[in-house]
């Protein structure tokens, strides 16, 4: 953790994926580009499945791949989960195939974490209408975390992604 | 059946300007990026200028930045290249495509030529 | 920018050959690459996308293979209407950029 430039983060300057919870991101970003402004060329291609509407939680899990979420304290950047990249893909690859094109390599869902816990912090995304919560009654903004586990008090209640994430300082199990 | 006609292309002088328009019809306009490309005579293809689905966000080619605008109009399903300062090596056959997800240009429109000389 | 280069740039052949280009990033470009035919006079037609994916009422005999920074297009068995020319080109960084092409000519 020396090295401050490192773990700078950078504020989102495209305006698809501003006001989605989180306003800053660290590049290189999970495709592996360099600079946001090649990162929103590329997102702005996925416009007409986003109008299509096939599903709610796309332009959040695009976001979160093209400009992942950063934090000052951990070094590396905070992606989607394999859960919502499933969702995701169960609604819109269908829709995708109608447009002549087959779900993309570089949003392949077996390249995110399963779900965010100790070993792996993810985004769950903002819960899809038709896809029923994980939690039987979701938590609400502002409860505690206990549904992590016995140290739910190292965790935080995000409202964009409406799950429980690591609070900064806490370790994450990302360097053992 | 997903088509698109460009027009406008023809002799112009250096310095001086054209538009050209690309119809678009069989798929709906107004949410698919576009984009424009050039081919000078027996080269390369060479990439110009993107516009997005909502008009918000424009991309150009260095050889072309502050002299070429892209725009649209979705009530007329149509793209448009307004090109300024023309140069005598902006002579190239222009194509309009559709953008599809990922960046991939699928269907291409059948081009127009534009020649600028003096 | 990215360069592409393509090699050969011109290859001739007959029918029933199997034929093989390649495309080079000068930076990784992950499977951001798309393969173009275009033939005398007409527009380019995508051919496939995503580096291996083939567009829809493309022969099955054209393919593509590769990730990072080397590409390869290969068509099994040449016909009278694959003669054209190829390009490669990447949508991962702009400018998007375009390999120079490759000239498919009747040996």
């Known amino acids: 953790f020396g090295d401050e430039e490192e773990r700078r983060c950078d504020p989102i300057r495209i305006s698809m994926c501003q006001n989605l919870g989180y306003n800053v991101t660290k590049m290189p970003n999970l495709v592996g580009h360099e600079l946001q402004t090649d990162a929103e060329l590329q997102l702005t291609t996925f416009t007409p499945l986003i109008q299509y509407g096939c599903s709610s939680q796309l332009q959040f899990f695009l976001c979160s791949v093209y400009v992942p979420m950063c934090t000052e304290k951990i070094n590396i950047p905070i992606g989607p989960c394999g859960g919502m990249c499933l969702s995701v893909k169960r609604r819109c690859e269908p829709v995708l195939k109608e447009f002549g094109f087959a779900w993309p390599e570089s949003l392949n869902c077996s390249k995110f974490p399963p779900q965010n816990d100790h070993n792996h912090m993810c985004m769950e995304g903002p819960g899809d209408e038709e896809v029923p919560l994980p939690h039987k009654t979701p938590i609400q903004p502002g409860e505690e975390c206990h549904s992590v586990g016995t140290n739910s008090d190292q965790y935080i209640w995000v409202k964009r992604s409406l799950n429980c994430v690591l609070k900064c300082g806490y370790d994450a199990g990302l360097y053992s | 059946e997903v088509q698109l006609v460009e027009s406008g292309g023809g002799l112009v002088k250096p310095g001086g300007s054209l538009r050209l328009s690309c119809a678009a019809s069989g798929f709906n306009f107004g949410i698919y990026s576009m984009t424009w490309v050039r081919q000078a005579p027996g080269k390369g293809l060479e990439w110009i200028s993107y516009?997005?689905?909502?008009?918000?966000?424009?991309n150009y080619a260095d050889s072309v930045k502050g002299r070429f605008t892209i725009s649209r109009d979705d009530s007329k399903n149509t793209l448009y290249l307004q090109m300024n300062s023309l140069k005598t090596e902006d002579t190239a056959v222009y194509y309009c495509?559709?953008?599809?997800?990922?960046?991939?240009?699928?269907?291409w429109g059948q081009g127009t030529l534009v020649t600028v000389s003096s | 920018d990215i360069q592409m280069t393509q090699s050969p740039s011109s290859l001739s052949a007959s029918v029933g050959d199997r034929v093989t280009i390649t495309c080079r990033a000068s930076q990784g470009i992950s499977s951001y690459l798309a393969w173009y035919q275009q033939k005398p006079g007409k527009a380019p037609k995508l051919l496939i996308y995503?580096?291996?994916n083939l567009l829809g009422g493309v022969p099955s005999r054209f393919s593509g293979s590769g990730s990072g920074t080397d590409f390869t297009l290969t068509i099994s068995s040449l016909q009278p209407e694959d003669f054209a020319t190829y390009y490669c080109?990447?949508?991962?960084?702009?400018?998007?950029?375009f390999g120079q092409g490759t000239k498919v000519e009747i040996k």
């Open positions: 516009i997005s689905g909502d008009s918000g966000y424009t």
């Open positions: 080109q990447q949508t991962y960084s702009t400018p998007w950029t």
């Open positions: 495509a559709r953008v599809g997800p990922g960046g991939w240009f699928d269907p």
């Open positions: 995503a580096a291996s």
